[in-house]
């Protein structure tokens, strides 16, 4: 569950559940910073624009990131 705060981490809970890359509208990867000491991954789904915080340590999520970056490299000229 994401939560909007300025000087805090965004994610309150995280999911290990894999996400179908085709159902993704957007995938945000927020690097660790002075505001939040951990990497955060926020998936926005096409359906209703629903968001989900993903666990960067989860194997399923790591595979998702690989699949998405593969897809992006295909699209880039």
């Amino acid at each position: 569950v994401p939560l909007s705060r300025t000087v805090r981490c965004t994610c309150i809970s995280i999911s290990n559940q894999p996400v179908n890359p085709r159902s993704l509208e957007k995938l945000e990867i927020i690097p660790a910073s002075q505001f939040c000491p951990r990497v955060e991954i926020i998936a926005t789904m096409k359906k209703k624009g629903e968001k989900r915080c993903l666990n960067p340590e989860s194997k399923a999520i790591k595979n998702l990131l690989k699949a998405v970056s593969k897809e992006m490299s295909k699209r880039s000229p």
């Epitope: 909007s4 805090r8 994610c11 995280i14 629903e50 915080c53």
Partner: antibody, heavy 121, light 109 residues
Amino acid sequence: QVQLVESGGGVVQPGRSLRLSCAASGFTFSNCGMHWVRQAPGKGLEWVALIGFDGINEYYADSVKGRFTISRDNSKNTLYLQMNSLRAEDTAVYYCARDWPEGYYNGMDVWGQGTTVTVSS
Amino acid sequence: EIVLTQSPGTLSLSPGERATLSCRASQSVSSSYLAWYQQKPGQAPRLLIYGASSRATGIPDRFSGSGSGTDFTLTISRLEPEDFAVYYCQQYGSSPPFTFGPGTKVDIK
């Protein structure tokens, strides 16, 4: 099965302290934000505090800010609420509840049975 | 701080009847952040509806939620004996506090 069990309630004098615990089982506790919610006798529900899955984020209701501290020990699958400077108006049933992570906001989907705190001289 | 108002305070109905419960917010709430709970005497609350209109796991389809902005509704299409309880709405906005409404009691006429 998925379960939350609160403990630590009791009768305490005004100005004293009490620590509540909430033992979680049946799910990946370390992935879930956790809440404390209370209910005074014959009254409605009042959100008290929230802690993020890794303890970085903490949020409090104005009525308890500066007096209550929420914390967690993921190695023990346990949530805590340290309550200091207790007042008569803190008398309530205290529930811990899970913040469900598999969506944007799926509400508090698992609740404990509650533990009763009575502040009285 | 967003304040939630629920109406009516008490709803007296008979089994089989339709119940319509209202929850009004003092300022706009994203529908993603509105939930409904049921509470029976001596029990913990139970999540019924999240995201204003999605039923939680195991909740019968006689329960439905709707609304957006500042006005939200919980509808119980046909009241069963086990549905007589207190119902709370709750908002989970972009920052705490995550306020609950004062509740609507549905009792047997």
